[in-house]
Interface confidence: low
């Protein structure tokens, strides 16, 4: 018996070839001997089954001996051993039908469970295996499951259902709702106007929902909201914002912020959440800010960092075009009188230089003296 | 993949000076650090200096200073380190360090009358 | 400058057997953020040296981990768990909290 393996919803063909290469008279019948369809001269005829409104055959291929039996959409229940009655004869194929599905939307929030469930008709044991848009593979049995989902799954998962030594494949688009970064870091010198940017890394036709930007300055002891806001269909509006600092928002995506000047109290970190309607848990992005200020005073010429940053922070001072005076893993750094000229205040990190500021020491004889 | 070429072997008389060139590759050049080791024949390792390409700024360990200058070309991603005066002690393999992690495959200097 | 001191200067083992580098600070390297700041590093024979360890007792990629960097302070140590024949070479320990960056003089260790 020939076995033929379907997928719910699609359209399967199954053949049926007589020796004659004529037209000649055939049935097609289900297990239970209850005629699907047949022909009567050059009519199709259909008979009682369940399959009425679904089934159908090619006329143009009867005049070559072939008989085909079309089952259009599917459904698992349309399992069962067909027959084909011709020239006496009777051809048996099996028809097993197979759906596979995602446990809810196949929206997902980054860190959510992907469940995959395979439908499939009594008496079957298929294997499935999928092959995620990253190359991962998981197998399994009805239910496949993958839990912490990542940016990298989104795309399309490839599943093979084997049965039989037969297989059939399945293509699922899965959308990892998350944003672009899970986290970035800003530097900027005292005074400078601070862009925050919040891409996500998905597109949709309506994104509605709301979200709220926590922050948490390295000065202050405890974590407050700087701005709520709503998102219909793309356009952001603002809800409330703190009166320090006054925070701007873009009105279209992605999410950006604006703070007009970089201080030392605003230096730490944030978490800005988006709930997404209809969707249960939020997306979250981490963003922090690092603020530099040189001064001078008196006789000392000081570098300040404020904010987060890594172990491998070094905060230096140097006269232009000279090598550094003073190079530490502080967050301060200064030199006691300092000689005129061009100063820079370096702050690398890992050895990447992040953040640069200048600053000019004039010649003792210019500046007033002190009483 | 991350990779650090330098120049060829040298041989200097006392007195004058090398440069030793160190082509970085595979990385952005000006995001880390290239850092200056010597090695003397049978010895131990010396840190002699290092350069920020992206903000040309230096650090010379205070044995060298003065006799050391460490440059870099971002067009090219080639970094250099200049040693004058040179003595028979200076006789050593010089390595070329992005950051502290990658390191080029070494020049001998070579300093004889 | 922070003075280095490695201990032994050499070091026989045979296979399969743990091995231990000692390597002492003259000042503390531990940072105020928590982190020590010393790296390890071996130099094979006739190879440019390679970073093992950084920041006291993190593992660089690609290095296997029979690896593993302890300590704090003044007081470090690198184990190896069991050495194997391509673990020869020169190691080095290497503080990077202030310049200059000073090495030990380093532990050659051979297979007996």
């Known amino acids: 018996k020939k076995v033929v393996l379907g997928k719910k919803g699609d359209t399967v063909e199954l053949t049926c070839t007589a020796s004659q290469k004529k037209s000649i008279q055939f049935h097609w019948k289900n297990s239970n001997q209850i005629k699907i369809l047949g022909n009567q001269g050059s009519f199709l005829t259909k008979g009682p089954s369940k399959l009425n409104d679904r089934a159908d055959s090619r006329r143009s291929l009867w005049d070559q001996g072939n008989f085909p039996l079309i089952i259009k959409n599917l459904k698992i229940e349309d399992s069962d051993t067909y027959i084909c009655e011709v020239e006496d004869q009777k051809e048996e194929v099996q028809l097993l039908v197979f759906g596979l599905t995602a446990n809810s939307d196949t929206h997902l929030l980054q860190g959510q469970s992907l469940t995959l469930t395979l439908e499939s008709p009594p008496g079957s044991s298929p294997s499935v295996q999928c092959r995620s848009p990253r190359g991962k593979n998981i197998q399994g049995g009805k239910t496949l499951s993958v839990s912490q989902l990542e940016l990298q799954d989104s795309g399309t998962w490839t599943c093979t259902v084997l049965q039989n030594q037969k297989k059939v494949e399945f293509k699922i688009d899965i959308v990892v709702l998350a944003f672009q970064k899970a986290s970035s870091i800003v530097y900027k010198k005292e005074g400078e106007q601070v862009e925050f940017s919040f891409p996500l890394a998905f597109t949709v036709e309506k994104l509605t929902g709301s979200g709220e930007l926590w922050w948490q300055a390295e000065r202050a002891s405890s974590s407050k909201s700087w701005i709520t806001f709503d998102l219909k269909n793309k356009e952001v509006s603002v809800k409330r914002v703190t009166q320090d600092p006054k925070l701007q928002m873009g009105k279209k995506l992605p999410l950006h912020l604006t703070l007009p000047q970089a201080l030392p109290q605003y230096a730490g970190s944030g978490n800005l959440t988006l709930a997404l309607e209809a969707k249960t848990g939020k997306l979250h992005q981490e963003v922090n800010l690092v603020v530099m200020r040189a001064t001078q005073l008196q006789k000392n010429l000081t570098c300040e960092v404020w904010g987060p940053t890594s172990p491998k922070l070094m905060l230096s001072l140097k006269l232009e075009n000279k090598e550094a005076k003073v190079s530490k893993r502080e967050k301060a750094v200064w030199v006691l009188n300092p000689e005129a000229g061009m100063w820079q205040c370096l702050l690398s990190d890992s050895g990447q230089v992040l953040l640069e500021s200048n600053i000019k020491v004039l010649p003792t004889w210019s500046t007033p003296v002190q009483p | 993949q991350v990779q650090l070429v330098q120049s060829g072997a040298e041989v200097k008389k006392p007195g004058s000076s090398v440069k030793v060139s160190c082509k970085a590759s595979?990385?952005?050049?000006?995001?880390?650090?290239i850092n200056w080791v010597r090695q003397a024949p049978g010895q131990g390792l010396e840190w002699m200096g290092v350069?920020?390409?992206?903000?040309?700024?230096?650090l010379y360990a205070q044995s060298f200073q003065g006799r050391v200058t460490i440059t870099a070309d971002e067009s090219t991603s080639t970094a250099y380190m200049e040693l004058s005066s040179l003595r028979s002690e200076d006789t050593a393999v010089y390595y070329c360090?992005?950051?502290?992690?990658?390191w080029g495959q070494g020049t001998l200097v070579t300093v004889s009358s | 400058d922070i003075v280095m001191t490695q201990s032994p200067l050499s070091l026989p083992v045979t296979p399969g057997e743990p091995a231990s580098i000692s390597c002492r600070s003259s000042?503390?390297?531990?940072?105020?953020?928590?982190?020590?700041?010393l790296d390890w590093y071996l130099q094979k024979p006739g190879q440019s040296p390679q970073l093992l360890i950084y920041?006291?007792?993190n593992r660089a990629s690609g290095v296997p981990d029979r690896f593993s960097g302890s300590g704090s302070g003044t007081d470090f140590t690198l184990k190896i768990s069991r050495v194997e024949a391509e673990d020869v070479g020169v190691y080095y320990c290497?503080?990077?909290?202030?310049?200059?960056?000073?090495f030990g003089q380093g532990t050659k260790l051979e297979i007996k």
């Open positions: 360090v992005k950051g502290l992690d990658h």
């Open positions: 595979g990385y952005t050049f000006t995001s880390y650090d």
């Open positions: 350069i920020s390409p992206s903000g040309d700024a230096t």
């Open positions: 000042q503390s390297l531990l940072h105020s953020n928590g982190y020590n700041y």
């Open positions: 920041l006291g007792s």
């Open positions: 290497m503080q990077a909290l202030q310049s200059p960056w000073t």
